[in-house]
Structures are given as C-alpha cells and as structure tokens.
C-alpha cells in the first residue's frame, strides 16, 4: 500500500539525547536517553539503543555525535566511522543506512592540542513496522557526552 | 490534545538566510534575512534574530554555519561553539537544544593558511506557541557570509 | 495558492545514493542511483543529475558527500566546494540553494597521510513544477564513493 | 499561564486504594513527563514515578513498585496516581509536577491523604 | 536511587550569606549540568528557584545563586531575609530515564 499521512493520526517522531550511560565500550551501539530533558518518543519505541518502528514509512533519520579529544590516543584509528545502520529480523546483520568517515586527530598539529569536530547524518528511509535503527561510532573513545545537546539520535517520518 | 496535523492547514516552515547584517558584534544572536532571496516565513513569525513558534508542537529546526579564515587570529579560542537555542518567558536565559563545537583553526597548519569549514545542526525539538529559537556561534568572527547559501536558519512543523 | 498537505495524497519524497557513475569528470553535476539499494524516488522525478519537482511547494533538500585522500594531490585547490543548486527553465544558470565549503586536506600533516571529512547540506526551498535540483562538488576528485551509504542526496515536502 | 490543579484531600483506611488527580492547563499536555512525588508529615520530599503522557510509558521507583498506577486521560489533560495497600506511612501530601527539560516547574498544591483506622 | 546528601539544618542572621551544599556521585550531579533547587515554605508546595545549576527562573530574586564542583553543587543565598527562612531541596538527573533528589536542609534565619 502506498504510505499515507492521515490527519487524525499522530505522525511519528522521536529525538534521543547522549547521556553518561550512552558508551558502552562494549562494541554494540550508543545507547540514548528517551524520556527526560529534550529526548521524547512519539509513534516510535526504543530497545537497547534501538528506535523500534511501529509504523511502515518512510523516515527521515538522524544523528549527530560530538567527537573531541587532546592529541590523538596511542593505539587510534585515523577515522571515526559514526553511521546510522537498521536492524531487521530477516537478516542477521545490520545493514549500513547512512554512513560518515572523518580523522578529526589531524586537525591538532601537537600531541598536546585539544580539538573538537562533530559529525551529522540525515536521510531518507523506508522502514517496516519492527524494524531498528542505531547509532554506532568507532572509535567511540572520541565521543564526547555533555548534556543531550551535542550527541543525539532522531527520527520522524515524512 | 494530541498534536495533529489536519489536512485543511498549512505545515508551519521557514528558512532564513545569512546577511551582512546578520553579525552583530554585540554578543546577541545572529540576526537573518526573513523575505528577499531564498528566505521565506510561514506560519512562524520572527523577531530579533529568533524564529517564533504560533503554533505549539514538534519541529525539525535546522542552522548551517559558514566558518573561515586565514590562519588564527591571535586570542580565538581554539573552539567554535555554534547551537540552537531557546528563549521561553519564564526561563530568562536561553535553553541549549542543539550545539556543535569544531576547532577548525586547527587545520591551517600555517598562519597564512586559507581555511573553510562548516558547521551542520538538525533535530526536532518540542516549542510552544510564543517560544523562540535563535542560532549564536561563539566566535562569531569567523563566520562568512555570502549571498545567504552558506550560512542559514530554519524549521518545519514534523 | 497556499501548499496544503491533503491527507489523500502521498507525500514527494526521495533518496538517492552515490554509485561508480556518479562522478563523470565532465564539469556536470553528481549522478545518482534512483532504484537499487537505499534509493527510491516517490513522487519525485530524475533526469541526469536532478531531482525533477512534479508537484510545487516547500522541500527540505540534503545531499552528504563522502571526502577523502591521501595527503593533497598537487593543483588541488585549498577549497572544496559542495552545493545544492536549483534549475529552472527562467533562467539559463543555475542558482545556489545551499553551499559549503571546507578545506580538509589542511587536516593532513604530511603529504602521505590518509585523512576523511564529509559534508552534509540541508534547507528548506521552494520549488515549482518542473523544475529541478542538482549537486555539485568543486573538486569532484576528492569525493570518496561506497556502496551508497556515505554520498547521497534527497528531498521531501514539508 | 502553565497550572497544575489538583483533587481534594482524602481519608482512607487501611488497605484501601486512594486515587489523586491533577488537571493541566496552559500548556501541551501531551508533550511533557508527570511526575509525583509526596512528602509525609515532617519528612523530606520522596519521587514515586513519572508518566509520559504522550506514550503512556511509565516509571516507578522501586520503593512504590507494585503499589503505584500513574495514568492519564488526554482529553481532560488530567494526570492520575493510584496508590493501593494503604499503610498509615502513606499518610503524606502528595503533589504532582510538571517535567520541563531537566526540572519540575510547576508543581500542583498538594493532595493530603490520610491513612487512619 | 540513594538521596542527594544534604546537610539537615544551615541558619544565619538577616543580611548574612549562607551557602546549602548537596552531594551526589558522578552518576548524577557530578555527571550532569542538571542540578535544580526547590525552596519550600511550610504548607506550601515546592518552588523552583535555581535549574541548570545556576540559572535562575524569572521571578527568582538574585539573591539566590547556584554553582557546582565536582560531585557538589551548592546554593547560596546572600543578604538573608525572614522569607527566606524555609526547606531547600537539591535535585538532579541521574541517567537512564531517573531522578533523585536530595534529603532536604531547613535554612533557620536567626
């Protein structure tokens, strides 16, 4: 069928904010707040970092990630790969939806130089009714977390 | 009442662009172009360099900002803070929504060195009827402005 | 008349995604994948390049490009430009909608080293039947093309 | 101007269930948190949950788990909070109030329930 | 979620400073700029006097100002008044969706 807006319905939405808790440093993905401060859910439920859709459409996702850090860490990639990628039950793997490659490390011209960069994604999607999307960054060790403003992860659909 | 958007009504929009005035030098937020060229308002009014919310509900609110320079100016800070932010009556000071911080000086590896950056932030926020939301890039002095493509300010109703 | 989005109609919409063929070194805009992958046109049109509006009103448009290198190649301009342009049958030029630039090549320290950057774009425009959106990257050597996730271009009505 | 006002005290008795309303007016309802939080009788203010009144979605501190419903009707712009197996330590006021961003601005005047046999 | 650590009582004269402290961890106040402050009168609800840990709600006289260290925010309120004389409450966001607030400090003017 092909997708529709209805003005009687609420049409979906979503902003999750970074908080403390969002690295892991597990390997899975950023994890977000969903209720408290500027983060919300409308139409749209989460799941261990996942915004879960509820509706098929088509959705304009996005995310933004603060990255910063003084000199380069011994041991660092030179690229931060920070992308958006959807998670469906008919594959076992998740599939990449938008993507960016950066090496912010190269700005700063002594090992001692704080830096800062940040990175934005955005884009159009088609989604189906309990599929996923996350965030991930490697290295997330440059993700710099302050207050839900400078790294955040929404959704609304078009 | 649940937010809906009713098919008789018109979807809240606007996009304004950078002008020679848009940088002030007085530590308020960036003033825009609202009507000529590309610019254009409707169903927001504006006041002061700030978008005004008529209607209540959830927006995608958007700024890019043009950064350039030749080397660094002597006493910059190393970083760049550009954000969204939000005046609401009962709260004087401004609410962060959305902030970037870049340190694009530090790619110019020489004091004579031509730079460009740009500076990209998107998100939807929730803005009651008479809120405003202003954009500020601290420091403002490299911000370039041309013919209101590079550096720009809008929303729309999601 | 004032655009209105009747609740019987399917939203214009689209995502296009960078491929091999995108970059044609003939000085002509960015070429796109309309139908594999990621990418679909909905209401929205494509010819060599462009998104062909068939229904007037606002858009939020986008593009991202993927940038990269290895140190910069010599006659490399300093600037690289990225932009969003409109074509009407009006005019015989194209007009800027939204444009960045950036200097990334000034991240690499030394000639050999591999650095990354992108570039995201996205405003709100109006656009008339018939006329169409193209982008344009100055130069197109340095855009980095990967399965359609890191380069892309899109638009919906708002 | 943004208002919370709540329901009138009540007496129970023990084992009994009381059920406090608070109703909105002067901003969208359905898009920020409610929450609850009481204070007995000389005691320091105690968070028991939170609504989202857009979603319905809930949270409870683990203190009151069990025990404590929050609901809400959006169409009255009405939050409500249930507490079932009164104890006389519920004898408390109880307010509601209002999450913006990170703060609770504005509060309700306060429900007194007293709990007696 | 454990309480913020608040001292029970703090007092001063008219015309004196005092300052109310509130201890958390780096899970909550520590790890956030979310620190909120409530002054409540007796049979009163509470009224918010201070978000983002020093910014002040119109209304609010500038008498009262906040500020944080560390793990550690603090209220202050210079030139003491008689209606100042009431409880004050420290609150913070902690993370993962929760809240906690502190144990409450009764502010005698002498």
């Known amino acids: 069928l092909i997708q529709e807006r209805r003005s009687h319905e609420v049409n979906p939405a979503a902003h999750l904010t970074g908080a403390n808790s969002s690295l892991t440093g597990s390997g899975g993905p950023l994890l977000w707040e969903t209720q408290l401060g500027l983060a919300f859910l409308r139409g749209l439920s989460y799941h261990d970092g996942a915004l879960v859709v509820t509706k098929a459409g088509y959705y304009y996702i996005y995310s933004k990630v603060q990255l910063g850090g003084v000199g380069c860490p011994l041991g660092l990639a030179s690229t931060i790969t920070h992308g958006l990628y959807k998670r469906t039950p008919r594959y076992p793997e998740e599939l990449e939806l938008l993507v960016s490659q950066q090496s912010p490390c190269g700005r700063a011209t002594s090992s001692s130089r704080v830096w800062w960069d940040s990175s934005f994604l955005g884009g159009v999607v088609h989604l189906e009714a309990g599929e996923e999307v996350v965030v991930r960054v490697l290295d997330e060790r440059l993700v710099r977390l302050r207050d839900g403003t400078r790294s955040y992860f929404g959704a609304f659909m078009v | 009442l649940i937010q809906e958007r009713r098919s008789h009504e018109v979807n809240p929009a606007a996009h304004l662009t950078g002008a020679n005035s848009s940088l002030t030098g007085s530590g308020g937020p960036l003033l825009w172009e609202t009507q000529l060229g590309l610019a254009f308002l409707r169903g927001l009014s504006y006041h002061d360099g700030a978008l005004v919310v008529t209607k209540a509900g959830y927006y995608y609110i958007y700024s890019k900002v043009q950064l350039g320079g030749v080397g660094c100016p002597l006493g910059l800070a190393s970083t760049i803070t550009h954000g969204l932010y939000k005046r609401t009556p009962r709260y004087p000071e401004e609410l962060e929504l959305l902030v970037s911080q870049q340190s694009p000086c530090g790619r110019a590896t020489s004091s004579s060195r031509v730079w460009w950056d740009s500076s990209f932030l998107g998100g939807v926020v929730h803005l009651e009827a008479g809120e405003e939301v202003v954009v500020r890039v601290l420091d403002e002095r490299l911000v370039r402005l041309r013919d209101g493509t590079r550096s720009y300010f809008g929303a729309f109703m999601v | 008349l004032i655009q209105e989005r009747r609740s019987h109609e399917v939203n214009p919409a689209a995502h296009l995604t960078g491929a091999n063929s995108s970059l044609t070194g003939s000085g002509g805009p960015l070429l796109w994948e309309t139908q594999l992958g990621l990418a679909f046109l909905r209401g929205l049109s494509y010819h060599d390049g462009a998104l062909v509006v068939t229904k007037a009103g606002y858009y939020y448009i986008y593009s991202k490009v993927q940038l990269g290198g290895v140190g910069c190649p010599l006659g490399l301009a300093s600037t690289i430009t990225h932009g969003l342009y409109k074509r009407t049958p009006r005019y015989p030029e194209e007009l800027e909608l939204l444009v960045s630039q950036q200097s990334p090549c000034g991240r690499a320290t030394s000639s050999s080293r591999v650095w990354w950057d992108s570039s995201f774009l996205g405003g709100v425009v109006h656009l008339e039947a018939g006329e169409e959106v193209v982008v344009r990257v100055l130069d197109e050597r340095l855009v980095r093309l990967r399965d359609g996730t890191r380069s892309y271009f899109g638009a919906f009505m708002v | 101007q943004v208002q919370l006002v709540q329901s009138g005290a009540e007496v129970k008795k023990p084992g009994a269930s009381v059920k406090v309303s608070c109703r909105a007016s002067?901003?969208?309802?359905?898009?920020?948190?409610m929450h609850w939080v009481r204070q007995a009788p000389g005691q320091r203010l105690e968070w028991m949950g939170w609504?989202?009144?857009?979603?319905?979605?809930?949270k409870y501190s683990q203190k009151f788990q069990g025990r404590v419903t929050i609901t809400r009707d959006t169409s009255a712009s009405t939050a409500y909070m249930e507490l079932s197996g009164l104890r006389s330590e519920d004898t408390a006021v109880y307010y509601c109030a209002r999450n913006y961003y990170n703060w609770f601005d504005p509060w309700g005047q306060g429900t007194l329930v007293t709990v007696s046999s | 979620q454990s309480a913020l650590t608040q001292p029970a009582s703090v007092s001063g004269s008219p015309g004196q400073s005092i300052t109310i402290s509130c201890t958390g961890t780096?899970?909550?106040?520590?790890?956030?700029?979310?620190v909120s402050w409530y002054q409540q009168h007796p049979g009163k609800a509470p009224k918010l006097m201070i978000y983002d840990v020093s910014k002040r709600p119109s209304g609010v006289s500038n008498r009262f100002s906040g500020s944080k260290s560390g793990n550690t925010a603090s209220l202050t309120i210079s030139g003491l008044q008689a209606e100042d004389e009431a409880d004050y409450y420290c609150?913070?966001?902690?993370?993962?969706?929760?809240?906690?607030f502190g144990g409450g400090t009764k502010l005698t003017v002498l």
């Open positions: 609150f913070s966001y902690a993370g993962s969706s929760t809240v906690v």
């Open positions: 780096s899970s909550d106040v520590g790890g956030y700029n979310y």
């Open positions: 002067g901003y969208t309802f359905t898009s920020y948190l």
């Open positions: 609504i989202n009144v857009g979603n319905g979605n809930t």
